[in-house]
């Protein structure tokens, strides 16, 4: 079950999916990628504040320690949950191959 | 296969697995929890340098944009990789149970 | 380049495919989009489709009207329980966020009895 | 779904003149906003990119900026062929934002 879906800072501060253009230049892909030329990288980005969308218990201890001990245990932190697969059509020796990526693209976010 | 296990920013600072002792009241326990009465935290602490135990293709390409767009993406975060177990001894309406956690306690740190 | 068809007229309750084809890239590694504007009216983002996962997103106003599909070749759009106020010049768009997004010329759909 | 809202129905400017549109995002979308023309019976044109990247072809008069939730198109020394409507595009793709485009703005060149 999800913890406080609500988010405290305001609308699209708190942890959320988020996506970011970015081309195979930025990602450093251009010498083994040939499509996409820009690739749209949903990530998961933007702050956890106190039990707002926490994983699992570990979350819910982590914020409780950040707010006794804030300069020796950090915040709970915005991560994937679980990934979308990426499909990149890669040079290869011999051509190109279609290669699916199951780790690439954040799907949903949780603290943690 | 993990990626750099060399903290560049000198021993003990980056992404690695501390423990921190914390009171049953600290945690908001004291009211459902007999035993133990101090948990010994293990949790994920430190910073996530550049490729430092970058968990899978996702944390390599936050770090790529985190350098281009310090603005909108963060830098990737130390989170556990997987947990022990831990008991705990719960008070009930009827007495007292052993129960256990699955979540509770970080095993293994890495960067995402 | 990407080119709409399957836009006609139609009466109300009517269902109807749109078909969106593309040349000259791979539509298997990017976002597509459909987007509607009404005769005299602004844009209107309908929902998205990333082709290599099949991963879909659609306007809060859609309601499950409208599902957007892909095979090999093509991004579909199919609508259901078409109303009058559904007559609108319909694209297909390589995007949202690409620097170098891609339009379509557009499709009209008019319902009307 | 997120709104965007863009003050000005319509904006009035001599040529050589500046024109300033607003859009405003009802939440928080960092950089995920693009801007689009529209001249009557075309598709619209890409003009700019995360906020404030120039898409290709697009002339140097025209300038994006804003971040967050507050953004704005700036058209400088203003010509005939830029009377059309203006819009704004949320670029993230996520269940609580969408691809919404603000109502547009429509420029005309005295």
């Known amino acids: 079950a999800r913890n406080g879906d609500h988010c405290p800072l305001g609308p699209g501060r708190c942890c959320r999916l988020h996506t970011v253009r970015a081309s195979l230049e930025d990602l450093g892909w251009a010498d083994w990628v040939l499509s996409p030329r820009e690739v749209q990288v949903t990530m998961c980005i933007g702050a956890c504040p106190s039990q707002f969308r926490a994983a699992n218990m570990h979350a819910q201890i982590k914020t409780s320690l950040h707010r006794l001990k804030p300069d020796t245990v950090p915040a709970p932190c915005c991560v994937p949950a679980s990934y979308n697969p990426m499909v990149l059509i890669q040079k290869t020796d011999t051509g190109v191959s279609l290669q699916t990526y199951d780790d690439l693209l954040a799907k949903d976010c949780h603290c943690i | 296969a993990r990626n750099g296990d060399h903290c560049p920013l000198g021993p003990g600072r980056c992404c690695r697995l501390h423990t921190v002792r914390a009171s049953l009241e600290d945690l908001g326990w004291a009211d459902w929890v007999l035993s133990p009465r101090e948990v010994q935290v293990t949790m994920c602490i430190g910073a996530c340098p550049s490729q430092f135990r970058a968990a899978n293709m996702h944390a390599q390409i936050k770090t790529s944009l985190h350098r281009l767009k310090p603005d909108t993406v963060p830098a990737p975060c130390c989170v556990p990789a997987s947990y022990n177990p831990m008991v705990l001894i719960q008070k009930t309406d009827t007495g007292v149970s052993l129960q256990t956690y699955d979540d509770l306690l970080a095993k293994d740190c890495h960067c995402i | 380049s990407v080119k709409e068809s399957g836009g006609r007229l139609v009466t109300p309750g009517t269902p109807l495919t749109l078909t969106c084809k593309a040349s000259g890239f791979s539509l298997s590694t990017y976002w597509m989009s459909w987007v509607r504007q009404a005769p005299g009216k602004g844009l209107e983002w309908i929902g998205t489709?990333?082709?290599?996962?099949?991963g879909t997103w659609y306007a809060s106003w859609v309601k499950g009207r409208f599902t957007i599909s892909k095979t090999s070749t093509t991004v579909d759009l199919k609508m259901t329980s078409l109303t009058t106020e559904d007559t609108a010049t319909y694209f297909c768009?390589?995007?949202?966020?690409?620097?170098?997004?891609?339009w379509g010329p557009g499709t009209l759909v008019t319902v009307s009895s | 779904d997120i709104v965007l809202t863009q003050t000005a129905a319509s904006v009035s400017e001599p040529v050589g003149g500046t024109v300033t549109i607003k859009c405003q995002a009802s939440e928080y979308i960092y950089s995920s906003l693009a801007w689009y023309q529209q001249k009557p019976g075309q598709p619209p044109k890409l003009l700019i990119y995360d906020a404030s990247d120039l898409a290709s072809g697009v002339p140097s008069r025209f300038k994006g900026s804003g971040y967050g939730t507050e953004f704005t198109l700036t058209i400088s020394g203003v010509q005939c062929g830029d009377a059309a409507t203006y819009y704004c595009?949320?670029?993230?793709?996520?269940?609580?934002?969408?691809?919404?485009f603000g109502g547009g703005t429509e420029v005309v060149v005295k």
């Open positions: 768009v390589r995007g949202p966020n690409y620097s170098d997004a891609i």
């Open positions: 489709i990333y082709a290599g996962s099949g």
């Open positions: 595009q949320c670029t993230d793709l996520s269940s609580s934002a969408g691809n919404t």
